[in-house]
């Protein structure tokens, strides 16, 4: 049943959810945690359970991608009566428990964030011993990793009829806007390809026809910063030399 606690300040927002006679299983996580690549982030997770004063063995687990089936990125186990949760798995050594599972807190710290860490994470606790029970967050917490632009590839490629085209690929979050500048170009926002499937932070811009020799510069910019890189086109004897 639901009981609304009205304290003397008449605060109605703190509605406590109870199941008779004890608390039911629930897990509380925020919708999202946002952090910059290279920094650390805390993924909060607290839980309630119906087993009052449970003191037996427990395991805390975090998985990525999807609940119940996603790969584990962290796991620790605490022996009966122990407040110390011994780490059994920490993917790439970057995950560590910040909370205290004995006190209903499974919060996890993730170090040295990368764009690839941008996904949903799910906390889970398992009781073993006199009581066998387990619970996992269904919706999880989304880790939103932001990053200043970085140009990962810039190149000049031959195209039909002895012409050349330039490609620039950059990563960043928010996805960066790309612009080309160069001989007789001024500053042109080149045709931008949509981020590739499975590469949500990568954006590619193409200059379809390079008509003049010289230096072509690709600039990537988002709210966190900008980056640029150049290629040089020199045509001689029907061939091209391109360098970055």
């Amino acid at each position: 049943f639901v009981r609304t606690k009205i304290d003397t300040t008449e605060n109605l927002l703190n509605t406590e959810v109870h199941s008779s006679p004890a608390q039911r299983w629930s897990m509380q996580v925020p919708p999202e945690v946002s952090a910059e690549a290279g920094d650390a982030a805390v993924l909060p997770c607290t839980f309630t359970h119906p087993h009052r004063h449970y003191d037996g063995p427990l395991t805390a687990i975090w998985r990525a991608g999807e609940p119940y089936a996603g790969p584990q990125v962290f796991r620790c186990a605490a022996a009966r009566g122990s407040e110390l949760c011994q780490t059994a798995l920490s993917l790439h050594g970057r995950f560590r428990l910040l909370g205290n599972p004995r006190r209903n807190d499974l919060s996890l710290r993730v170090e040295r964030l990368a764009l690839a860490d941008d996904r949903r994470y799910f906390c889970r606790v398992e009781f073993a011993g006199d009581v066998h029970d387990r619970y996992e967050s269904r919706h999880g917490v989304r880790l939103h990793v932001t990053a200043a632009p970085r140009i990962v590839n810039i190149s000049v490629l031959p195209s039909p009829a002895h012409a050349f085209r330039a490609l620039c690929t950059a990563e960043g979050e928010p996805p960066p806007a790309l612009a080309w500048s160069g001989p007789a170009l001024g500053n042109s926002l080149a045709a931008v390809r949509s981020p590739r499937e499975g590469h949500g932070h990568l954006v590619t811009a193409e200059l379809p026809a390079l008509t003049h020799d010289g230096r072509y510069t690709c600039t990537a910019a988002n709210s966190l910063g900008r980056s640029e890189a150049s290629v040089y086109l020199f045509r001689f004897h029907g061939a091209s030399g391109a360098s970055t």
């Epitope: 304290d7 406590e16 629930s26 509380q28 919708p31 999202e32 946002s34 909060p44 209903n104």
Partner: antibody, heavy 124, light 113 residues
Framework: QVQLVQSGAEVKKPGASVKVSCKAS????????MHWVRQAPGQGLEWMGW????????NYAQRFQGRVTMTRDTSISTAYMELSRLRSDDTAVYYC?????????????????WGQGTSVTVSS | DIVMTQSPDSLAVSLGERATINCKSS????????????LAWYQQKPGQPPKLLIY???TRESGVPDRFSGSGSGTDFTLTISSLQAEDVAVYYC?????????FGQGTKLEIK
């Protein structure tokens, strides 16, 4: 009634540390997050982080990482916020504020009770 | 981080008239899993700490007069005071609690015309 009472005003020199206390009454201290929010003179509100008094778990805003430490003493229902390596731009009023009810199933992390604020002046 | 932008920065309204303050978030604070907007409004009077007015974008905190109402969804939100009273002179802040770190708008100063 719910009350958060903070320690008095402080004047510090650059490079020093300050520790502000926040004594809670009128509710179960370990049932709610405690947030710290600061407000520079004539400016808006800036969230610094929280402590979960039940587990002692903390979460700090990135810009304060390495300089802020939030602790609590459950025996006297008091939360503390220590800020080190003070600079002149740390001059502000620092507030503690009660946050989410830990047992509530939705992430309703609004600040429904606030301390009176502690003025911290950093000046050489 | 989610950036919260309020408009206008200041507002002068006659007593008894309607006051409207807007808040825009740089990304949506609507959570599809429960269809709730993780947005709150606070009132801060001079020399006082902030006071919670509204949460879930439109739910009034107990004890808050019903002339205060919140609306909006996704990225665009509004705090409305239907009939301005002298005691409503304050700075009003929106805050998102969808994404950590939590962020506030820069504030809107409400005065009497």
């Amino acid at each position: 009634q719910v009350q958060l009472v903070q320690s008095g005003a402080e004047v510090k020199k650059p490079g020093a540390s300050v520790k502000v206390s926040c004594k809670a009454s009128g509710y179960t201290f370990t049932d709610y997050y405690m947030h710290w929010v600061r407000q520079a003179p004539g400016q808006g509100l800036e969230w610094m982080g929280w402590i979960n008094p039940n587990s002692d778990g903390t979460n700090y805003a990135q810009r304060f990482q390495g300089r802020v430490t939030m602790t609590r003493d459950t025996s006297i229902s008091t939360a503390y916020m220590e800020l080190s390596r003070l600079r002149s731009d740390d001059t502000a009023v620092y507030y503690c504020a009660r946050g989410r009810l830990l047992r509530f199933f939705d992430w309703l992390d609004v600040m429904d009770a606030w301390g009176q604020g502690t003025s911290v002046t950093v000046s050489s | 981080d989610i950036v919260m932008t309020q408009s206008p920065d200041s507002l002068a309204v006659s007593l008894g008239e309607r006051a409207t303050i807007n808040c825009k978030s740089s990304r949506s604070v609507l959570y599809s899993s429960n269809n709730k907007n993780y947005l709150a409004w606070y009132q801060q009077k001079p020399g006082q700490p902030p006071k919670l007015l509204i949460y879930w974008a439109s739910t009034r905190e107990s004890g808050v007069p019903d002339r205060f109402s919140g609306s909006g969804s996704g990225t665009d939100f509004t705090l409305t005071i239907s009939s301005l009273q002298a005691e409503d002179v304050a700075v009003y802040y929106c805050q998102q609690y969808y994404s950590i770190p939590y962020t506030f708008g820069q504030g809107t100063k409400l005065e009497i015309k």
